[in-house]
Interface confidence: low
């Protein structure tokens, strides 16, 4: 809390400019009008204020807007955003994607902070769903964003947004998340032809049921072992040796290296030894 003191004669700020960097903290508090600051927030980032001075500016905005800043101010916060707490941000109502982008830009290159997490949370809740433009923006700044969402929150992702998802965006997703995303991806890509469809759906297959894997095995897709190892064990177990051979194509030889790991291990134990022998890989059921 900065003590209230009268502004010295001739020091009253008429605009937000570089002269303010020479003001002491108490002078900023006394001489800068909060409403002026709010209307000229876009200038603050061009001025090399100290962290202590930024604290004073934040304090002035907090006093002017105790219920939370309006979006016109939020959009121009710039580096002052880094001074905000999650509790401050929870008071905001951010609806513009441009505002979101401006604030994410400030934090670019850093880990996702609790402040940014709260900002995104507020934005997505305000929109009601993760539309394609939002998802595009968020995954551009934070590739792991999708896998940070709970299955329940992922259910608000419309299938049309799935087109914005890149394979690396799903790297850290677990089975429960892929269970939600896979049906959406299947719907989104349903009109593509076989080989193009497989390229798009591949990253989501950790949520695929047995019947879909059986269907894929009829399409000469040549699934790689890395994708196969991420499949649901319960979806892989009912597949026959012939189906797995068709599904993997030339990659079937990789089963030997993975024979001790799930889902390969559990699948091997479900097969007849005669069938396994047809692969010529020395797999023991």
């Amino acid at each position: 809390e900065v003590e209230k003191t009268a502004c010295p004669s001739g020091k009253k700020a008429r605009e937000i400019d570089e002269s303010l960097i020479f003001y002491k903290k108490w002078e900023l508090e006394a001489c800068v009008d909060a409403a002026l600051l709010a209307t000229q927030m876009d200038r603050v980032n061009a001025i090399p204020f100290t962290y202590e001075q930024l604290d004073v500016l934040k304090h002035k905005l907090d006093e002017l807007y105790p219920q939370g800043y309006p979006e016109s101010v939020i959009q121009h916060l710039g580096y002052l955003f880094l001074k905000m707490s999650p509790e401050d941000i929870r008071k905001w109502n951010v609806t513009s994607l441009e505002t979101l982008k401006a604030l994410l830009e400030v934090n670019k290159g850093h880990e996702m902070s609790p402040q940014v997490a709260t900002l995104i949370d507020r934005f997505v809740k305000g929109r009601g769903q993760l539309d394609k433009d939002t998802l595009d923006t968020l995954t551009a700044f934070y590739p792991g964003y999708l896998c940070s969402l709970s299955p329940e929150e992922l259910s608000s992702v419309p299938p049309s947004s799935i087109w914005a998802v890149r394979p690396q965006d799903l790297d850290t997703c677990d089975p429960r998340q892929l269970d939600v995303l896979y049906p959406k991806a299947r719907l989104a890509f349903q009109n593509m032809n076989g080989s193009e469809y497989f390229v798009k759906i591949q990253s989501f297959l950790g949520g695929a049921p047995t019947e879909d894997l059986k269907a894929l095995s009829q399409q000469n897709v040549s699934m790689d072992l890395a994708t196969f190892m991420k499949l649901r064990t319960d979806a892989v177990l009912p597949l026959t040796v012939a189906e797995v051979q068709k599904l993997l194509g030339p990659h079937v030889e990789g089963l030997k290296a993975e024979e001790r790991h799930r889902p390969v291990r559990d699948w091997i134990l479900r097969q007849r030894q005669d069938d396994l022998d047809t692969l010529g890989l020395g797999l023991q059921g």
């Epitope: 999650p86 509790e87 929870r90 880990e111 996702m112 609790p114 997490a117 709260t118 995104i120 949370d121 792991g144 896998c147 940070s148 969402l149 709970s150 299955p151 329940e152 929150e153 850290t172 429960r176």
Partner: nanobody, 124 residues
Framework: QVQLQESGGGLVQPGGSLTLSCEAS????????KAWFRQAPGKEREFVAS????????AYADSVKGRFTVSRTYAKNTVYLQMNSLKPEDTAVYYC?????????????????WGQGTQVTVSS
């Protein structure tokens, strides 16, 4: 409903380490364990650490940064608090909290379910 069970508390000497764990059961698809708070005798409950759904986003109280680490299991139903370089002022009852939403947060109002707590005493 979500039930939370903390464990791992105890008596430890200054400079020592402890790992607390909190296992959740019940409706953990929506509400999952994601934070630790603590309450020392005669003081208010205070935030210690929080972790987001994906496990990569974390938040810590300044007083524990660099000493405590919050983590979670792959299945998302257990959250841990690894406490190193413990000090006498870390003595408190430690509570696990579960909430909805994916962001880590220090705001106790964001949590819907709380455990019974586990006592941590740091003393020589």
């Amino acid at each position: 409903q979500v039930q939370l069970q903390e464990s791992g508390g105890g008596l430890v000497q200054p400079g020592g380490s402890l790992t607390l764990s909190c296992e959740a059961s019940g409706h953990t698809d929506s509400y999952y364990p994601k934070a630790w708070f603590r309450q020392a005798p005669g003081k208010e409950r205070e935030f210690v650490a929080s972790i987001g759904w994906g496990g990569r986003m974390t938040a810590y109280a300044d007083s524990v940064k660099g000493r405590f680490t919050v983590s979670r299991t792959y299945a998302k139903n257990t959250v841990y608090l690894q406490m190193n370089s413990l000090k006498p002022e870390d003595t408190a009852v430690y509570y696990c909290a579960a909430g909805i939403g994916w962001a880590p947060t220090a705001d106790s109002g964001e949590y819907d379910y709380w455990g019974q707590g586990t006592q941590v005493t740091v003393s020589s």
